[in-house]
Amino acid sequence: MMTGTIETTGNISAEKGGSIILQCHLSSTTAQVTQVNWEQQDQLLAICNADLGWHISPSFKDRVAPGPGLGLTLQSLTVNDTGEYFCIYHTYPDGTYTGRIFLEVLESSVAEHGARFQIP
């Protein structure tokens, strides 16, 4: 039975040109995390495999940095980066857990800075 839950930063906002950390955390399960996939809509951003390390999709390689941890740092944000992001945890023996983050990239400097994992 899958007992785990994914905690995410939920809805976050950041300024155009800035950076943001996308972070999820799997709790309430003893399952082993074998891999985390980061996706935006139907596009793969990155994969962090516990043994093989990181895969960064070529279309994002100049703007995505691995980490911290299993998270993903998105840099040089544009308004087009606004949207849903998914962390997909592959675990053994539970299976797959999915978390959702909504990122809004704001034009002005009045972006909220309250997000827990946001880079100053």
Epitope: N37, Q43, L44, I47, S57, P66
Partner: antibody, heavy 119, light 107 residues
């Protein structure tokens, strides 16, 4: 120039083990994962597992159920794949391949090692 | 495990023909797909990754596309050196799996 040079052909008895080596050159060994892929005669490709020399992480295809062991000697930039409890169905060409940096794509391959399992 | 199904398993074509090979994943693999070319008695060679980026030195006549579960490798104008077997592979989740291959033969 990146090169992966594998050990020579082997003929083994059923129930025995084989250890294939893959010597890497032309790049920093610890910066790239090494994978092992096999191909039975006239068949397709089958991923066996990989080894990350950066932090000694090893991952296996569970279809081999503990029969495969992947190791490396970083001092000689050599990766090894050992397959135990051999059976006739393990007759195949075994390839090592390097993964590109920050990409799960195998960009350079060894020449292959033919392993024949026969009584 | 994710199954990768290639079609056709073989095809006959002439030099100059446009050739299309398809690969279907049994479940969502986003764009985590790679294509390899293999000639008889030789190791596979990386052609395309992610799934539309050509590897270094790969001619522009090779192109890849797709996302989700359906992927395509296209050779815009087949050359004599392109007669080979082509494999797709997914790396969305382990174990990594390959398609059964498509053999491109001379008509």
């Amino acid at each position: 120039e990146v090169q992966l040079v594998q050990s020579g052909a082997e003929v083994k008895k059923p129930g025995s083990s084989v250890k294939v080596s893959c010597k890497a050159s032309g790049y920093t060994f610890t910066e790239h994962v090494i994978h092992w892929v096999r191909q039975a005669p006239g068949q397709g490709l089958e991923w066996m597992g990989g080894f990350n020399p950066n932090h000694d992480g090893t991952i296996y295809n569970q279809i081999f159920r503990g029969r495969v062991t992947i190791t490396a000697d970083k001092s000689t930039s050599t990766a090894y794949m050992e397959l135990s409890s051999l059976r006739s169905e393990d007759t195949a060409v075994y390839y090592c391949a390097r993964a590109a940096k920050l990409l799960f794509a195998m960009d350079y391959w060894g020449q292959g090692t033919t392993v024949t399992v026969s009584s | 495990d994710i199954q990768m199904t290639q079609s056709p398993s073989s095809l006959s074509a002439s030099v100059g023909d446009r050739v299309t090979i398809t690969c279907r994943a049994s479940q969502h693999v986003s764009n985590a797909v790679v294509w390899y070319q293999q000639k008889p008695g030789k190791a596979p060679k990386l052609l395309i990754y992610s799934p539309s980026y050509r590897f270094t030195g790969v001619p522009s006549r090779f192109s890849g596309s797709g996302s989700g579960t359906d992927f395509t490798l296209t050779i815009s104008s087949l050359q004599p050196e392109d007669f080979a077997t082509y494999y797709c592979q997914q790396h969305y989740s382990t174990p990594w799996t390959f398609g059964g291959g498509t053999k491109v033969e001379i008509k």
